[in-house]
């Protein structure tokens, strides 16, 4: 079927919003009143990839601009990007495999797990204003859960 | 050569767990998916559920509290285990590999084992 | 779940004839249509995925086509070792979902 998407809102376990520094990375810092505003709206489509009872695939593009999250190798290290992309193309139902993550919801909170990179986890520091990044642990210091808030279209 | 067989007890009595094996061959099971298929005599196909290549599992809702998939990817086995059979459960198993086309992993089905009848009578 | 609407249930044809088997999808499963063939004893053979993307060794007598809900199997000439059974497959979401089959006979 035609890729299905809703628009969403993500926080961190500490209830830091995510939102743009510079063109081509999110960080995660606490948000009140009218800054609610400056975060990041993603449409997130629901995407063929290892579905199970526990996991549903994924892409995380940002509302209304051709950029989605991405899983790539850097120096040897799975990392997470801003990607360009040509929006005549995207969102796609059959999405590239970088581009997938397993959302995986316990416990009313979600993970993203990289399709590309099985336990690496979009991720954010306990610091302010740190880079949303992709990270190899869970239970660690770093932010691995997530909350999910609905977007009117 | 892709090749997947079946093979386990052709008859279970009611209410026990039905255990089949599927070996399969030419290819690794880290790295594709297997999902495991049924027809009673003279009927449909109908989809039990799938083992993926990273080891988690989708099951078919009406037999998800009774159906296990596993596998062991050093053998080459995946596994299904179905529990409190009856009669309705006798069929033809099958075990068959998923789709690989063009580097996406498709959600269908291309290389299918030769199925092994298991009947659930007393 | 998706549900599949296969028809007709049963065909009888001859050798040379154009045959065409037709599935409806009860949501739109955009192109992840398939379609199998199976002869008795035997597991079933995959023939076209992707709604029109023929395996390879298929012979090019088999065709698909259609997108969305409506999907159309074709024989353009029978040839004495098509008849069979036929079932199409939608892998467009979980659970996947058979049609009801199509017996293909000799007239």
């Known amino acids: 079927a035609p890729v299905r998407s809703l628009n969403c809102t993500l926080r961190d376990s500490q209830q830091k919003s995510l939102v743009m520094s510079g063109p081509y990375e999110l960080k995660a810092l606490h948000l009140q009143g009218q800054d609610m505003e400056q975060q990041v709206v993603f449409s997130m489509s629901f995407v063929q990839g290892e579905e199970s009872n526990d996991k549903i695939p994924v892409a995380l593009g940002l509302k209304e601009k051709n950029l989605y999250l991405s899983c790539v190798l850097k120096d040897d290290k799975p990392t997470l990007q801003l990607e360009s992309v040509d929006p005549k193309n995207y969102p796609k139902k059959k999405m590239e495999k970088r581009f997938v993550f397993n959302k995986i919801e316990i416990n009313n909170k979600l993970e993203f797990e990289s399709a590309q990179f099985p336990n690496w986890y979009i991720s954010t520091s306990q610091a302010e204003n740190m880079p949303v990044f992709l990270g190899g642990t869970k239970g660690g210091q770093d932010i691995t859960d997530f909350t999910m808030q609905f977007v009117s279209s | 050569e892709v090749q997947l067989q079946e093979s386990g007890p052709g008859l279970v009595k009611p209410s026990e767990t039905l255990s089949l094996t599927c070996t399969v061959s030419?290819?690794?099971?880290?790295?594709?998916?297997v999902s495991w298929i049924r027809q009673p005599p003279g009927k449909g196909l109908e989809w039990l559920g799938l083992?993926?290549?990273?080891?988690?599992?989708y099951y078919n809702s009406p037999l998800k509290s009774r159906l296990t998939i596993s596998k062991d990817n050093s053998k080459s086995q995946v596994s299904l285990k179905l529990s409190s059979v009856t009669a309705a459960d006798t069929a033809v198993y099958y075990c068959?590999?998923?789709?690989?086309?063009?580097?996406?992993?498709?959600?269908?089905?291309?290389?299918w084992g030769q199925g092994t009848l298991v009947t659930v009578s007393s | 779940d998706i549900q599949m609407t296969q028809s007709p249930s049963s065909l009888s044809a001859s050798v040379g004839d154009r045959v065409t088997i037709t599935c409806q999808t009860s949501q739109d499963i955009d192109d992840d249509m398939n379609w199998y063939q199976q002869k008795p004893g035997k597991a079933p053979k995959l023939l076209i995925s992707l709604g029109s993307h023929l395996r390879p060794g298929v012979p090019s007598r088999f065709s698909g086509s259609g997108s969305g809900t409506d999907f159309t199997f074709t024989i353009s000439s029978l040839q004495p070792e098509d008849f069979a059974t036929y079932y199409c497959?939608?892998?467009?979401?979980?659970?996947?979902?058979f049609g009801q089959g199509t017996k293909l006979e000799i007239k």
């Open positions: 030419g290819f690794s099971l880290s790295d594709f998916g």
């Open positions: 083992i993926w290549g990273g080891g988690d599992t």
């Open positions: 497959l939608q892998s467009d979401r979980f659970p996947l979902t």
């Open positions: 068959a590999k998923q789709t690989n086309i063009w580097g996406y992993d498709l959600y269908s089905m291309d290389y």
